[in-house]
Interface confidence: medium
Amino acid sequence: GQFRVIGPGYPIRALVGDEAELPCRISPGKNATGMEVGWYRSPFSRVVHLYRNGKDQDAEQAPEYRGRTELLKETISEGKVTLRIQNVRFSDEGGYTCFFRDHSYQEEAAMELKVEDPFYWVNPG
């Protein structure tokens, strides 16, 4: 059946060194356990995280994300997932695309991650 993929309509913000959570869901909600779910960086299509055949496909990840991502799947049976990126770097800032693929049917949603420096401040003087 057909569905839409929905991500946040505003930039997700995270501090360098912290975690970022990028949410994504399908609408109408349905069980996505058997689907392929993933995130890639726009516009270079580098794989950030991939879930396929009921498992995270760590070997498919771009090297700069290896060991730093986690797909939160507690609500995947309702078509809702969240990608957690740990130890956020400045280089993580930019566009991401989340996709759900059910057999030959695939839909995507774009989202943006803004990375901020926790130590940046403006001298009021």
Epitope: R4, P8, G9, Y10, E21, P23, P28, G29, L72, K80
Partner: antibody, heavy 122, light 107 residues
Framework: EVQLVETGGGLVQPGGSLRLSCAAS????????MSWVRQAPGKGLEWVSD????????YYADSVKGRFTISRDNSKHTLYLQMNSLRAEDTAVYYC???????????????WGQGTLVTVSS | DIVMTQSPSSLSASVGDRVTITCRAS??????LAWYQQKPGKAPKLLIY???SLESGVPSRFSGSGSGTDFTLTISSLQPEDFATYYC?????????FGQGTKVEIK
């Protein structure tokens, strides 16, 4: 079956305080954001506050900011609303509602409690 | 804040009628709109989310459409249990806001 049961409502004088609780069951409480929505007698719905799945992010309507505090105890499957400096215009039925998603990315509500009436009057 | 305006505020209809309720947002909200049904003394019940997705367990006579600023809830054939008040809600940006409600009464 999802159940949300609010308690703690009642009659309070202007300037007083009240703490509402919402006991949740039938779903993985720690995986969902939660909200409070109120309805003044004979009026429409007004969103009050919400909190993400972990409790680390909270948002408030301007009308209650600085006076109300939302919190949660995931180990007890309970949502709270601490209401201070209450005013007559806070009189309403307060509903606890389960957000459709786990983090605050646009909240709508797929399950609601039965509500608890808060009356602020001298 | 985004202001949600529903029309009409109330309407009278008969069982079997097709009923349409509209909701207009003061600025674009994409498809971030939900519809609820509320009966007297009861909590609201989610009918439609993402402007057009039917909530599980809700009868197919309910449908939603629209995007941007103009949205519609349609009941294709009104049933006795559908007499209630209907609210739209935007979840595009804080604070989440509701329409003032549309009361559907028996003619």
């Amino acid at each position: 079956e999802v159940q949300l049961v609010e308690t703690g409502g009642g009659l309070v004088q202007p300037g007083g305080s009240l703490r509402l609780s919402c006991a949740a069951s039938g779903f993985t409480f720690s995986s969902y954001a939660m909200s409070w929505v109120r309805q003044a007698p004979g009026k429409g719905l007004e969103w009050v506050s919400d909190i993400n799945h972990s409790g680390g992010s909270t948002y408030y309507a301007d009308s209650v900011k600085g006076r109300f505090t939302i919190s949660r105890d995931n180990s007890k499957h309970t949502l709270y609303l601490q209401m201070n400096s209450l005013r007559a215009e806070d009189t309403a039925v307060y509903y606890c509602a389960k957000d459709y998603y786990d983090i605050l990315t646009g909240s709508f509500f797929d399950y609601w409690g039965q509500g608890t009436l808060v009356t602020v009057s001298s | 804040d985004i202001v949600m305006t529903q029309s009409p505020s109330s309407l009278s209809a008969s069982v079997g009628d097709r009923v349409t309720i509209t909701c207009r947002a003061s600025q674009g909200i994409s498809s971030a709109l939900a519809w609820y049904q509320q009966k007297p003394g009861k909590a609201p019940k989610l009918l439609i989310y993402d402007a057009s997705s039917l909530e599980s367990g809700v009868p197919s006579r309910f449908s939603g459409s629209g995007s941007g600023t103009d949205f519609t809830l349609t009941i294709s054939s009104l049933q006795p249990e559908d007499f209630a008040t209907y609210y739209c809600q935007q979840f595009n940006s804080y604070p989440w806001t509701f329409g003032q409600g549309t009361k559907v009464e028996i003619k």
